[in-house]
């Protein structure tokens, strides 16, 4: 449905971000984000900046990372003479009024924006090779960038379910995006996978009075393990449960508990 949906990520705070490769004018990009249930993304500072950088660095878009790419963000200079000396955004401001981190913690300008007192001016995030953020760059609002960044805000998120014996995991987020993995998922996200014997399973993140949880999921493991051990959320055998220092690196599967020896699982 949305072929331009490339990557998404959510943080525990309830903020999710998606990055899209699509040649669009600013207005069309802003509308695309609204249609997905979000808004053109702010990239203020701190956690927000880190989340967006992680999306960019997850891999190049079309062209294989050979050229610089420009992504629309919610940064603009309203009509009227902004103060170009106002650091660090040179008079530009974020569209949404929600408080962010310190704006001194933002990216640099790739080149100094021009002064203009007449037209509304926009800005893009320039990414070197499509993956390494170089900084902000002024761009006329009616020109086309290579893509755009959307932001979504949710009150609660589901932590990623542990696969257990599941394979072929696929996430479908409510902002119309398919992904192979999300650390946190907003309500409405559907996770599908295959259990042993190629049995399909599908769970959905739902929100209730308590918080967010995966429906139809007993515990937090998608597919039960045939054995007793899980390592990093996946089924494991006892020999694979020792870390480099000989410590026990596994946890016990549902129905088992850690034995007295501290390194084996016994029936609970």
């Amino acid at each position: 449905e949305h072929p331009t949906a490339d990557r998404a990520g959510c943080s525990a705070s309830g903020a999710c971000y998606s990055l899209h490769h699509a040649t669009m004018k600013r207005q069309a990009a802003e509308e695309a984000c609204i249609l997905r249930g979000g808004a053109l993304s702010t990239v203020r500072a701190g956690a927000e900046l880190r989340a967006v950088l992680a999306l960019l660095r997850a891999g190049p878009g079309p062209g294989g990372g050979s050229k610089d790419l420009l992504f629309w963000v919610a940064l603009q200079l309203p009509p009227g003479c902004g103060d170009p000396k106002r650091l660090p955004l040179r008079g530009f401001s974020w569209l949404s009024s929600d408080p962010g981190g310190l704006e001194s913690d933002t990216l640099q300008w790739v080149e100094e924006p021009q002064r203009s007192c007449t037209a509304r001016r926009c800005a893009v995030l320039q990414a070197t090779g499509g993956v390494e953020p170089a900084g902000w760059k002024e761009m006329r609002c009616h020109l086309r960038a290579n893509g755009y960044l959307c932001k979504y805000q949710f009150e609660v998120l589901c932590p990623a379910p542990r696969p257990g014996a599941a394979s072929n995991l696929s996430y479908r987020a409510p902002f119309q995006l398919h992904s192979a993995a999300l650390d946190f998922s907003p309500p409405g996200t559907e996770v599908s996978a295959l259990c042993r014997g190629q049995l399909p399973i599908s769970v959905t993140c739902i929100a209730d009075e308590i918080g967010a949880r995966w429906d139809k999921l007993s515990g937090d493991v998608l597919c039960p393990c045939p054995g007793r051990y899980l390592r990093a959320g996946k089924c494991a055998e006892l020999p694979n449960c020792l870390d480099d220092l000989g410590g026990f690196a596994c946890e016990c599967a549902t129905g088992f508990e850690l034995g007295k020896d501290g390194r084996s699982c016994v029936t609970s």
Epitope: T4, A22, Q27, A32, L35
Partner: antibody
């Protein structure tokens, strides 16, 4: 001058499908989202969905998923909406519309296609 | 989805009278994304006021719009015969974009 020219009145049987068109002129078809809106006789307006002809991105109102399918042909600057499994509830005037000069207000509308089931 | 409730559903006004109709949103809407349309029988809707208070091209200055958050209104300072129509408020702050049920304005 921006114009959206829609196909003519349709009379259809229950259970059938219809496909209506919206030919755009006077602007760059691939640069703007095209929206579709439903209006039942004597009633208000309902947003069905939108398509971005530049890359065929679509977004639907949940209510119309499975009922409406939006497509676009860039070579002819024409957007299409197909309605399937028609019932009496689908008898309405359907408008294609898009924003152009004003932020997110749908400021150009076709003349409407009337569908009677 | 955001539900827009318009009131009154039907109203009549004398020529020269001041007219105000309201649009209440079920949750807060940015004023940039609240618009009004005018529709007359047999015609397509026309953008009338955009971003709460900006008059669309060709709209007479007797029309004005105001509001913020969940409460918006359209006012005609002095009713004229050509103003008889149905007016719809419309939001595009959240998808799906939604319309109010309309206020039908008649001449008394």
């Amino acid at each position: 001058e921006v114009q959206l020219q829609q196909s003519g009145t349709v009379l259809a049987r229950p259970g059938a499908s219809v496909k209506m068109s919206c030919k755009a002129s006077g602007y760059t078809f691939t640069s703007y989202w095209m929206h579709w809106v439903k209006q039942r006789p004597g009633q208000g307006l309902e947003w069905i969905g939108a398509i971005y002809p530049g890359n065929s991105d679509t977004s639907y109102n949940q209510k119309f998923k499975g009922k409406a399918k939006l497509t676009a042909v860039t070579s002819t600057s024409t957007a299409y909406m197909e309605l399937s499994s028609l019932t009496n509830e689908d008898s309405a005037v359907f408008y294609c519309t898009h924003y152009y000069g004003s932020d997110y207000a749908m400021d150009y509308w076709g003349q409407g296609t009337s569908v009677t089931v | 989805q955001i539900v827009l409730t318009q009131s009154p559903a039907i109203m009549s006004a004398s020529l020269g009278e001041r007219v105000t109709m309201t649009c209440t949103a079920s949750s807060s809407v940015s004023s940039s994304y609240l618009h009004w349309y005018q529709q007359k029988p047999g015609s397509s809707p026309k953008l009338w006021i955009y971003s709460t208070s900006n008059l669309a091209s060709g709209v007479p200055a007797r029309f004005s719009g105001s509001g913020s958050g969940t409460s918006y209104s359209l006012t005609i300072s002095s009713m004229e015969a050509e103003d008889a129509a149905t007016y719809y408020c419309h939001q595009y702050h959240r998808s799906p974009r939604t319309f109010g049920g309309g206020t039908k304005l008649e001449i008394k």
